[in-house]
Interface confidence: medium
Amino acid sequence: TCEIVTLDRDSSQPRRTIARQTARCACRKGQIAGTTRARPACVDARIIKTKQWCDMLPCLEGEGCDLLINRSGWTCTQPGGRIKTTTVS
């Protein structure tokens, strides 16, 4: 089970919204807080350790997940071509 603790949005830049989200999760052993289908979720800890972010299935149904080459996060590409980038910190 997960709950969103903080959600900050910055829409000051045209055509770009930056959102910072923090979630708190209660996960089973071997799991850790992550993102599944664009929502906070408990995921296999090995995914986080190896930075194989797309293996969490972080994007919405119908979107394509693409790992950032430096493994700092992932992008979700909508069918229309719009790209949403998520970085992990």
Epitope: R46, Q52, C54, G64, D66, L67, I69, N70, T75, T77
Partner: antibody
Framework: AVTLDESGGGLQTPGGALSLVCKAS????????MGWVRQAPGKGLEWVGV????????SYGSAVKGRATISRDNGQSTVRLQLNNLRAEDTGTYFC???????????????WGHGTEVIVSS | ALTQPSSVSANPGETVKITCSGG??????YGWYQQKSPSSAPLTVI????KRPSDIPSRFSGSKSGSTHTLTITGVQAEDEAVYFC??????????????FGAGTTLTVL
């Protein structure tokens, strides 16, 4: 069957530029990250660089960083390597590589092209 | 850099083990690539530690123990004679994650 077909190699002049193209078939091209690996004559394999699925993100090996540009056209199922300011040490065979799953690393290549030979000489 | 033996040899039917150690990204695993001649393209025999492409015989397997990865060929055959390269990733603040390969191990089938 997965096929990766490179072209564009040949004799190049030092200081010049080359453009190699890899034409892919047999899989959903836009669902895989792609890369380039090269091999100097009599030497081992060397990482050139990679590009993500959408083409928005790239990374390059230290030997070509600042001189190389990798791009892709998902409609044409092609990935291109442009290498500028050519040096003699760029001589070798250049292989196109396909990543398995969501990403490409030197541990996750599951298909290779036949290679295209590049000779940099005056 | 990745460290692997420069050469190994075996008789047909024997089991061969080729080791590879080092690299900066053991979590991402290792791959093994076979090259039968300097002018031919590499062929993936193992990727991501233990995954085997569908066209690769089951005698090829990969395993990991700590920071060392091992390619095992159980019941080696004459056609397995080749150079085998291992691959992994390294991280540098300058280039980020960049692929690295071992110098290659020449397998001779006696």
């Amino acid at each position: 069957a997965v096929t990766l077909d490179e072209s564009g190699g040949g004799l190049q002049t030092p200081g010049g530029a080359l453009s190699l193209v890899c034409k892919a078939s047999g899989f959903t091209f836009s669902s895989y990250q792609m890369g380039w690996v090269r091999q100097a004559p009599g030497k081992g394999l060397e990482w050139v660089g990679v590009i993500n699925k959408s083409g928005s993100d790239t990374s390059y090996g230290s030997a070509v960083k600042g001189r190389a540009t990798i791009s892709r056209d998902n409609g044409q199922s092609t990935v291109r390597l442009q290498l500028n300011n050519l040096r003699a040490e760029d001589t070798g065979t250049y292989f196109c590589a396909k990543g398995s799953a969501s990403y490409i690393t030197a541990a996750t290549i599951d298909a290779w092209g036949h290679g295209t030979e590049v000779i940099v000489s005056s | 850099a990745l460290t692997q033996p420069s050469s190994v040899s075996a008789n047909p039917g024997e089991t061969v083990k080729i080791t590879c150690s080092g690299g900066g990204s053991s979590g991402y695993g290792y791959g093994w690539y076979q090259q039968k001649s300097p002018s031919s393209a590499p062929l993936t025999v193992i990727y991501w530690n233990d995954k085997r492409p569908s066209d690769i015989p089951s005698r090829f397997s990969g395993s990991k123990s700590g920071s060392t990865h091992t390619l095992t060929i159980t019941g080696v055959q004459a056609e397995d004679e080749a150079v085998y390269f291992c691959g992994n990733d390294d991280y540098s603040s300058d280039s980020g994650y960049v692929g690295v390969f071992g110098a290659g191990t020449t397998l001779t089938v006696l």
